[in-house]
């Protein structure tokens, strides 16, 4: 939820592009802002989906996980698969779409009693102020009921991406949310990790634009986990 200090800035109410990779939580002190993507996405399609080989979940887009494409298939041949939506079967949290987690073999909506932190690969920092409330996020992707509300331009105040004009998303800037540009091909994005964190992100970037996924740069595959660069790339 917006008011949660921890992972509070889910970009609300935006159908993601094909293959739906979005950016993820940024760092409180990182030079490159990060972003967080909302809960289970009902718009994702896998038409013309280009398989992307992987070895771990972190190499896949936000709305993907790394696994063998066939049941009981060769574990050595793994690709990025579309995340599992609510009420779908799962074996681990990473299989479930953002805003959900794996409970008793089923993807269920994240709730207040289950902590789902996500951290960026760069630095995060805990802030000991009176707002440091632990809270999760659960986001819908329904269209806004108020379609006639003037769409915000870059920098405008917003609560969800439908408050912003085309090509912009609603993303956090410090402690509030403003309309920011959707990322273009080649721009740096932040890969999420489905791990706990007491870090506090202050900045968000938007997710990658249509037809793009946030993936590790090929020439950075050998880099250490903490410094791998992710950019918006064509599927």
């Amino acid at each position: 939820t917006l008011n949660s200090v921890l992972n509070s800035n889910a970009i609300k109410n935006l159908p993601p592009p094909l293959g739906g990779a979005a950016g993820h939580p940024g760092s409180a002190v990182s030079a490159a802002p990060g972003i967080l993507y909302p809960g289970g996405n009902k718009y994702q399609t896998i038409d013309n989906y280009q398989p992307y080989p992987c070895a771990e979940d972190e190499e896949c887009g936000t709305d993907e996980y790394c696994a063998s494409p066939t049941r009981g298939g060769d574990a050595g041949v793994q690709i990025c698969l579309a995340c599992r939506k609510r009420r779908k079967r799962c074996m681990r949290h990473a299989m479930c779409c953002p805003g959900n987690y794996c409970k008793n073999g089923i993807c269920v909506s994240s709730d207040q009693n289950h902590f789902r932190g996500e951290i960026e690969e760069t630095i995060t920092e805990s802030f000991g102020n009176d707002h440091s409330t632990l809270d999760g996020y659960s986001r819908r992707t329904t269209l806004s009921s108020k379609m006639y509300h003037t769409k915000g331009q870059e920098g405008s105040v917003c609560l969800r991406s439908s408050d912003c004009a085309s090509g912009l998303c609603c993303a956090r800037h410090f402690w509030s949310k403003i309309c920011k540009p959707v990322l273009k091909e080649g721009q740096v994005c932040t890969k999420h990790r489905r791990k706990g964190s007491h870090g506090l992100e202050i900045f968000q970037r938007c997710y990658c634009g249509e037809g793009l996924s946030c993936r590790i740069q090929k020439d950075h595959h050998q880099a250490s986990n903490s410094s791998r660069l992710h950019t918006c790339q064509r599927h």
Epitope: L2, S4, D135, K146, E154, V157, L159, R160, D163, F174
Partner: antibody, heavy 117, light 107 residues
Amino acid sequence: EVQLLQSAAEVKRPGESLRISCKTSGYSFTENTMHWVRQMPGKELEWMGGINPHKGGTSYNQKFKGHVTISVDKSSSTAYLQWSSLKASDAAMYYCARDWLGAMDYWGQGTLVTVSS
Amino acid sequence: DTVLTQSPASLAVSPGQRATITCITSTDIDDDMNWYQQKPGQPPKLLISEGNTLRPGVPARFSSSGSGTDFTLTINPVEANDTANYYCLQSDNLPYTFGQGTKLEIK
């Protein structure tokens, strides 16, 4: 300590202009959106609009758009609510409120605007 | 706009009893509901923010529940200084909208 100090009460005539202020302290002004909320006598609260000082980006409630202007002066960490031509129906208590991740957590003490001919 | 229907408009509760205020929204707003207390001559005070999160310094007597369209603020037990108007506020989509308010009176 976060503080939002609003300007004193105003008594105006219809058609006159007015600018009320909200001077902030105790936090980094450019890091939080500032909202303006109206409360007519004995009535509920109404969100008028907000401004993010970072780029000066605003968003208005359609009900108030075009009738009021929200602005900021970053150098003095102050937010403003302005009317170019007041109406009798603008008589109300006006609050500035700081945004904290969607909620309005700190509020000014309010500025009472009286519009009477 | 998301319309918030708050009820009851007023209620009177004896000290030590439970007070319950409800807020129903015209659209699904997840858990993006906030609750405020406003005493005469004062600005609203944030009691509970999104995700049913009790704000620092607010007594645990105040609690809230709900998500989607149905929300409840509970004060249990009520104390004499809880006399005030209470408002719900949705922060899910612009424009922000408030409930009409509930006047709580302590018998």
